[in-house]
């Protein structure tokens, strides 16, 4: 006869491990008992369980409540046991020693491998600001046994670096993602992808990038100066900028206070029917926590009568 077992039994932390040991004997051979022991190198054999044909299952006090025989129906030549709720400390070498009649004793060893799936964590780096050099965007750490694989999935251009720390029964892997911040990265996803044999599918943690910036400010509304004449209604100036975080807008007049009747509505400056009093230099001040920008424009309200007089003069001068 001969023993049938596995070289390696792999189980995920918390699952039950079946330790196989089957005696394939000739007809008429019987198994008297199967002794299971843990036999890690450098240590004596530690009893796990004893399966006896008459006495039944004996479980070592160290494994009380954790070792069982597989559910019926059971083959009397099957000396397999179930190790319930595998923990990392269970990882190691095991031996089954089978006493048979009349063939004698046989033994076989197997290695129990307990996979510890990682619980990854993602930590954003310092605040990203446009204009910085290469900056840490995020780091992702995962600890498991064996060491997990940590990669990044993103459209953003950057560089990665990884380091590993080995512990007694596991390894922690940390991967960092560095980039040169630019406004185009704002709102882009940066995903940490953790792979491990103990996971049914990769674990993914997504971080949305926030890059602080403030664009140059400009003012729209003066494209056609001829529209800015006395009596015109609905004239307005709009301050154009963008930023992260979203900026706030403030309007002032450089050569004095804002004329009465002028309404400030965020990025827009609304005028009442235009008069010459509205002529002047207007300043849009844009700011966020990152920076501030100014843009100024000169408003020159035209008097149509003056214009026509000038035209007449010009005509008459000719």
């Amino acid at each position: 006869g001969e023993l049938e077992t596995s070289d390696v039994v792999t189980v995920v932390l918390g699952q039950d491990a079946k330790l196989p040991c089957f005696y394939r004997g000739d007809s008429g051979e019987q198994v008297g008992q199967v002794a299971w022991a843990r036999v890690d190198a450098g240590e004596g054999a530690q009893e796990l369980a004893l399966l006896h044909s008459k006495y039944g299952l004996h479980v070592s006090p160290a494994y009380e409540g954790r070792v069982e025989q597989p559910p019926p129906p059971r083959n009397p030549l099957d000396g397999s046991v179930l190790l319930r709720n595998a923990v990392q400390a269970d990882e190691g070498e095991y031996e089954c020693r089978v006493s048979t009649f009349p063939a004698g004793s046989f033994q076989a060893r197997l290695r129990l491998r307990v996979l510890v799936p990682p619980l990854p964590s993602l930590n954003p780096g310092p605040a990203l600001e446009e204009g910085q050099g290469l900056t840490l965007a995020a780091s992702c750490t995962a600890e498991g046994s064996p060491a997990p694989s940590v990669t990044w999935d993103t459209e953003v251009k950057g560089t990665t670096s990884s380091r590993s720390f080995k512990h007694s029964r596991s390894a922690a892997v940390t991967s960092e993602f560095h980039l040169v911040p630019s406004r185009s990265m704002n709102g882009q996803p940066l995903t940490c992808v953790v792979s491990h044999p103990g996971l049914l599918q990769d674990q993914r943690i997504t971080h949305i990038l926030h890059v602080s910036f403030l664009a140059e400010a400009s003012v729209r509304g003066l494209e056609d100066q001829n529209l800015w004449h006395i009596g015109r209604e609905g004239a307005m100036l709009k301050c154009l900028s963008e930023g992260q975080p979203p900026p706030s807008y403030n309007w002032t007049r450089l050569d004095g206070p804002l004329p009465s009747g002028v309404r400030v509505d965020g990025d827009t400056l609304g005028f009442p029917p235009l008069t010459t009093e509205h002529s002047g230099i207007y300043v849009c001040h844009v700011s966020n926590e990152f920076s501030s920008r100014d843009s100024q424009v000169t408003v020159d309200v035209l008097d149509p009568q003056e214009d026509s007089g000038k035209q007449v003069d010009l005509v008459s001068a000719s």
Epitope: E47, K54, Y55
Partner: antibody, heavy 123, light 107 residues
């Protein structure tokens, strides 16, 4: 024929010592675990101590730990129990019994017993 | 330690009677249970081992059953030489422990 014969019992004062012997014959002595079991007058059976065939594994009942010492001489097919600091409650018939080692520290039931030797602890 | 509780502590029966003695372990012991017979002034004698296996030379009127925590010794037809004290013993853990005994007396 398997035979176990105890000797060495007798009357001893509290605090005294006694050494019991158990001579074995009719079987391969060194391959069996051997135990001492006692029975106080009119009482039930109480396991005292056990020694493995190679003397590597020795166990005691809490009631005798530190006072009794079990040993064996496989060349003489003899089991011993050295009893020190004896107390009145150690008064009992002491039996030796054999059991087969299955594996680790797991034994069969004791299938053969000696006739017993009486130890009386009294002043 | 595992406690072994035997019942009854004594019983009176007649020759030919069927006698049942029970033994309960305080925790599971698989079939690591033995039954012994002891007569006054004599050493215990192994009757049943592994809960239900008859020791060589023991009459077949003795039988044992059970596993785990509950066990039974049955004498199918009591004979005059069966009047004695019977003990159960677990040897699943150390220390091995005995029941307190059941004395079978003549009615």
């Amino acid at each position: 024929e398997v035979q176990l014969v105890e000797s060495g019992g007798g009357l001893v004062q509290p605090g005294g010592s006694l050494r019991l012997s158990c001579a074995a014959s009719g079987f391969s002595f060194g391959t069996y675990g051997m135990s001492w079991v006692r029975q106080a007058p009119g009482k039930g059976l109480e396991w005292v101590s056990r020694i493995s065939g190679d003397s590597a594994n020795i166990r005691y009942a809490d009631s005798v730990k530190g006072r009794f010492t079990i040993s064996r001489d496989n060349s003489k097919n003899t089991l011993y129990l050295q009893m020190n600091s004896l107390r009145a409650e150690d008064t009992a018939v002491y039996y030796c019994a054999r059991a087969e080692l299955l594996a680790f520290d797991v034994y069969t039931a004791s299938d053969y017993w000696g006739q017993g030797t009486l130890v009386t602890v009294s002043s | 330690d595992i406690q072994m509780t035997q019942s009854p502590s004594s019983l009176s029966a007649s020759v030919g009677d069927r006698v049942t003695i029970t033994c309960r372990a305080s925790q599971g012991i698989s079939s690591y249970l033995a039954w012994y017979q002891q007569k006054p002034g004599k050493a215990p004698k192994l009757l049943i081992y592994a809960a239900s296996s008859l020791q060589s030379g023991v009459p077949s009127r003795f039988s044992g059953s059970g596993s785990g925590t509950d066990f039974t010794l049955t004498i199918s037809s009591l004979q005059p030489e069966d009047f004695a004290t019977y003990y159960c013993q677990q040897h699943y853990t150390t220390p091995p422990t005995f029941g307190q005994g059941t004395k079978v007396e003549i009615k």
